[in-house]
């Protein structure tokens, strides 16, 4: 089950070719793998990557170009992801998620 995350709905508008940053607020005890998803209208949610919160390693889903996304936690309660070289097809709702067990 999804857990340990505190949602904070935000809307971001950026020009194509620019970058955007998304923040995930983590509740106490969120450790292990944190996943980033993109949900676009009319499509199933797509996992983009997952992040090992201990070693700060990023594992991209196949087909995701290296350097498109980067994520890092400067505190244990906050995870940030940057999206680079934005195109129209990057539009959608981005989610972070983690699971117990």
């Amino acid at each position: 089950k999804s857990s340990n995350l505190e949602g904070r709905t935000k809307s971001v508008i950026r020009q194509t070719g620019s970058s955007a940053e998304i923040t995930c607020d983590l509740a106490e005890g969120s450790t292990g793998y944190i996943h980033w998803y993109l949900h676009q209208e009319g499509k199933a949610p797509q996992r983009l990557l997952y992040y090992d919160s201990y070693t700060s390693s990023v594992v991209l889903e196949s087909g995701i170009s290296p350097g498109k996304y980067d994520t890092y936690g400067s505190t244990r309660k906050n995870l940030r992801m940057i999206l680079r070289n934005l195109i129209e097809n990057d539009s959608g709702v981005y989610y972070c998620a983690t699971w117990d067990g």
Partner: antibody
């Protein structure tokens, strides 16, 4: 086997510059955040700088901010630390370390001595 | 920045002794505390992460406990290879900071 090998240390005069390198092997370097940690002779450990996997997020200790620059070349599996305006208090063994909230692999270190 | 204070700074013990090292944070860091072992001329080695989780390959005689501001590393039965310096590190926020170290030597 994960290996981190630092190089580039040596003796430099105050105000001088050095560039440290850390060659990584045995893991997917481009997926990991990396760090520099230093240890002055006979002293404790001091975190110096961190860089995220694609270099988007970079952090420095206040003691080196504006003088040191961390960077990485994922195509060469190498981490760098450019050190400018060196001071006597920068004398230390410099380690590169893999990880974020924990440092699970460390190099053997390279000694930087700042002295006239 | 979060300050980490270790005690004692050094201790003498014999093989087979139970050894306890403490680490205190200047503010609440939940359980985000790691312990490292360092032998002379070598790089530090991760022993315990998030206060009580044993790193893979680390002997079970090492254990960690604590939460908030007060933490403990315990070696249940000291072995010859355990004579080293031990450091705590908070991983609650950047900059991650280390304790000053505790040197464990032979009595």
């Amino acid at each position: 086997e994960v290996q981190l090998v630092e190089s580039g240390g040596g003796l430099v005069q105050p105000g001088g510059s050095l560039r440290l390198s850390c060659a990584a092997s045995g893991f997917t370097f481009s997926s990991y955040s990396m760090n520099w940690v230093r240890q002055a002779p006979g002293k404790g450990l001091e975190w110096v700088s961190s860089i995220s996997s694609s270099s988007s997020y970079i952090y420095y200790a206040d003691s080196v901010k504006g003088r040191f620059t961390i960077s990485r070349d994922n195509s060469k599996n190498t981490l760098y630390l450019q050190m400018n305006s060196l001071r006597a208090e920068d004398t230390a063994v410099y380690y590169c370390a893999r990880g974020g909230w924990l440092y699970d692999y460390w190099g053997q270190g390279t000694l930087v001595t700042v002295s006239s | 920045d979060i300050q980490m204070t270790q005690s004692p700074s050094s201790l003498s013990a014999s093989v087979g002794d139970r050894v306890t090292i403490t680490c205190q944070a200047s503010q609440d860091i939940s359980n985000y505390l790691n312990w490292y072992q360092q032998k002379p001329g070598k790089a530090p080695k991760l022993l315990i992460y998030d206060a009580s989780n044993l790193e893979t390959g680390v002997p079970s005689r090492f254990s960690g406990s604590g939460s908030g501001t007060d933490f403990t590393l315990t070696i249940s039965s000291l072995q010859p290879e355990d004579f080293a310096t031990y450091f705590c590190q908070q991983s609650y926020s950047t900059p991650q900071t280390f304790g000053q170290g505790t040197k464990v030597d032979i009595k």
